[in-house]
């Protein structure tokens, strides 16, 4: 038994036929010693007398609000809730399994940007006697603060014969660092109480993995002279992180009729305009995704092909590009070849995802995982890799990126990746290895030496352990190169001579 909140206790029960249950001792919160009686819920039947009451809790009939009285006066209450465990698994009767992205997904969370604000939601078919409370933190062993509001009923839907209720909650990390590479996941814990049943649900994620931008805004069409083509332009959503030269999006533009089975024109672009073929009764739709990390696409923003919108052209690039210096970032403090670094780091992002796209959808945060990836270097809040830090002195950040590149380059050349099951030199991992080396050399030519981090002694003996470790390393690398790519894109756009 444990205290959920003041005067509310949860009794954990192994739930099987003829289970002995749990013996619970309740103590009346009063200085009085004599003449105390106990009742359960609305019943006037006296269950026992004395300052303490010992009960055997086996089923829901034994749970409820126990009250101690003296001479018709209520002294205190103790509400007992039951938490069922069947075959070693805690019950999940209150919430509905959303089955997306995988089975046993009860909580789903999304963030519109990297500000540390996110929304979680869950579904239930229960309409009454239902309460939720939500707690969250960054990391579990030394938790950092995340503040969550109250859970509210956000939608009701009819699904066949049942009604389905959606509840949601908004949370905000207390000291968010949008530009940093997350090393500890956000933990979300939801306590659910239905009548006398208690259940708890948890979710663990990095903000980067739950990013889903809002749709692009202000779609405009401009027909091109003497052509079937139309220039469509749009803007970044207002809710997306700024500056856009650092937090860049990529876009998918699609022209399609009302049915998904109809023919379509489709093009991907990093710019905020594209030229497509419009046809009668079709719509142009645009959606957005983080440019450097493969999280969710936004919903579509659409405009009909007919009546070709305003004639405003609008073809801003959303903040990439910029000319590049030929200088390298030597410890003395000159600039790197920002544009070359930008191109190579963007290639690294692509390679890190193609090296194992499945890694993006495997849940590898199991027991002890917080420690496993603690060994790899992360771009942290104080490393100066945020836009302001880059403007002040980009050397701190570039040195940190260089350390990370060398570290991962060594890891990808180590027994973890060279041992069984074997990978060929020109596999995506091989290309990734070569590109890491290439970018690290761009940052620091021969003859200059920045301090590098010691590589940890991770030598798994079994092929399956090696495989798991590869997944974890590639997963971390995806996050690391995304931050590096943002740094170089922003540098190319704002810091190039």
């Amino acid at each position: 038994i444990w205290e959920l909140k003041k005067d509310v206790y949860v009794v954990e029960l192994d739930w099987y036929p003829d289970a002995p249950g749990e013996m619970v001792v309740l103590t009346c919160d009063t200085p009085e010693e004599d003449g105390i009686t106990w009742t359960l819920d609305q019943s006037s039947e006296v269950l026992g007398s004395g300052k303490t009451l010992t009960i055997q809790v086996k089923e829901f009939g034994d749970a409820g609000q126990y009250t101690c009285h003296k001479g018709g006066e209520v002294l205190s209450h103790s509400l007992l809730l039951l938490h069922k465990k069947e075959d070693g698994i805690w019950s999940t009767d209150i919430l509905k399994d959303q089955k997306e992205p995988k089975n046993k997904t009860f909580l789903r969370c999304e963030a519109k940007n990297y500000s540390g604000r996110f929304t979680c939601w869950w579904l239930t078919t229960i309409s009454t006697d239902l309460t939720f409370s939500v707690k969250s933190s960054r990391g579990s062993s030394d938790p950092q603060g995340v503040t969550c509001g109250a859970a509210t009923l956000s939608a009701e839907r009819v699904r066949g014969d049942n009604k389905e209720y959606e509840y949601s909650v908004e949370c905000q990390e207390d000291s968010a660092c949008p530009a940093a590479e997350e090393s500890l996941p956000i933990e979300v814990m939801v306590d659910a109480v239905h009548k006398l049943k208690y259940e708890n649900y948890t979710s663990s994620f990095f903000i980067r993995d739950i990013i889903k931008p809002d749709p692009p805004k202000n779609l405009q069409l401009k027909p091109l002279k003497n052509s079937r083509q139309v220039e469509v332009s749009w803007e970044y959503p207002d809710t997306w992180s700024t500056p856009h030269s650092y937090f860049s999006l990529t876009f998918c533009v699609q022209v399609q009729g009302k049915s998904a089975r109809e023919k379509k024109d489709r093009v991907f672009t990093d710019k905020t305009s594209a030229t497509v073929i419009c046809r009668k009764n079709a719509s142009i739709s645009v959606r957005a995704q983080d440019r450097y990390y493969s999280s969710s696409w936004s919903e579509w923003a659409s405009v009909p092909c007919s009546g070709s919108g305003s004639s405003r052209g609008g073809s801003g690039s959303g903040g990439s590009g910029g000319g590049g210096s030929k200088l390298r970032a030597v410890p003395g403090g000159s600039s790197p070849a920002w544009t070359q670094c930008q191109q190579l780091s963007q290639k690294l992002c692509t390679l890190a995802w193609s090296a194992h796209p499945l890694v993006g959808h495997m849940d590898l945060r199991e027991e002890g995982d917080e420690e496993t990836t603690n060994d790899v270097p992360h771009i942290q809040c104080g490393d100066g890799c945020d836009p302001q830090g880059l403007r002040d002195n980009s050397q701190f950040c570039l040195q940190r990126i260089h350390q990370g590149l060398i570290f991962y380059e060594k890891l990808l050349g180590s027994d973890i990746f060279t041992g069984e099951p074997s990978l060929l030199p020109d596999s995506p991992v091989g290309q990734l290895h070569a590109s890491l080396l290439g970018l690290s050399q761009l940052l620091q030519p021969e003859g200059h030496h920045w301090e590098t981090q010691q590589i940890p002694s991770l030598s798994p003996s079994q092929p399956w352990q090696r495989l798991l470790l590869r997944f974890k390393i590639l997963r971390s690398l995806q996050a690391f190169v995304a931050v590096a790519a943002r740094v170089f894109a922003h540098g190319a756009a704002t810091l190039s001579p």
Epitope: R228, E262, K263, F268, T275, I277, K280
Partner: antibody, heavy 118, light 107 residues
């Protein structure tokens, strides 16, 4: 399944015109874009243009503009590509292809060899 | 127009080995890049679309990667039926253009 069957080989004199046909089956003709791509002997692939059979809209590669006409006959599910003012370097295999997506080529015809020779 | 350059022009590989084919665009084309295989006397066949998307019915040994200006088609373990010419094609803007092709031949 989706199939494209093209007309037979042609031999033409320089300055003449050629009209190649492409009969579609296995799908609703107006549901796919139709492209024409050619390949000179021992050379690579060259895109010529597309037509939307639903409305007759076309887009031609600048190189062929004014010399090529793409048409369709929805009653027979057939597409046509006419190339005028033929020169010897127009000698090539001409392919039609169809796709629901406008910008790449999924289903290909078997090709029609057009030889331009005096 | 966007110029597509493929390398190498010819690649000699032994059966069972891995083949890596490159395609470079003259300007950034995001992931608007598609790969085709053509065997002698046959029409080309679509292998990969939008840089990395696989086509049903195409063996899993064919994979694509890249974005921007550099793209790669990888054949993980060459089978006898894979010896052919491979073309990349950009769809970023009209006119649609192809690379000159890479011939994969038996070593």
């Amino acid at each position: 399944q989706v199939q494209l069957v093209q007309s037979g080989a042609e031999v033409k004199k320089p300055g003449a015109s050629v009209k190649v046909s492409c009969k579609a089956s296995g799908y609703t003709f107006t549901d796919y874009y139709l492209h024409w791509v050619r390949q000179a002997p021992g050379q690579g692939l060259e895109w010529m243009g597309w037509i939307d059979p639903e409305n007759g809209d076309t887009e031609y590669a600048p190189k062929f503009q004014g010399r090529v006409t793409m048409t369709t006959d929805t009653s027979t599910s057939t597409a046509y590509m006419e190339l005028r003012s033929l020169r010897s370097d127009d000698t090539a295999v001409y392919y039609c292809n169809a796709n629901k997506e406008l910008r790449y080529f999924d289903v290909w015809g078997q090709g029609t060899m057009v030889t331009v020779s005096s | 127009e966007i110029v597509m350059t493929q390398s190498p022009a010819t690649l000699s590989v032994s059966p069972g080995e891995r083949a890596t084919l490159s395609c470079r665009a003259s300007q950034s084309i995001s992931i608007n890049l598609h790969w085709y295989q053509q065997k002698p006397g046959q029409a080309p066949r679509l292998l990969i679309y939008f840089a990395s998307q696989s086509i049903s019915g195409i063996p899993a040994r064919f994979s694509g990667s890249g974005s921007g200006t550099e793209f790669t088609l990888t054949i993980s373990s060459l089978q006898s039926e894979d010896f052919a010419v491979y073309y990349c094609q950009q769809s970023n803007s009209f006119p649609l253009t192809f690379g000159g092709g890479t011939k994969v031949e038996i070593k």
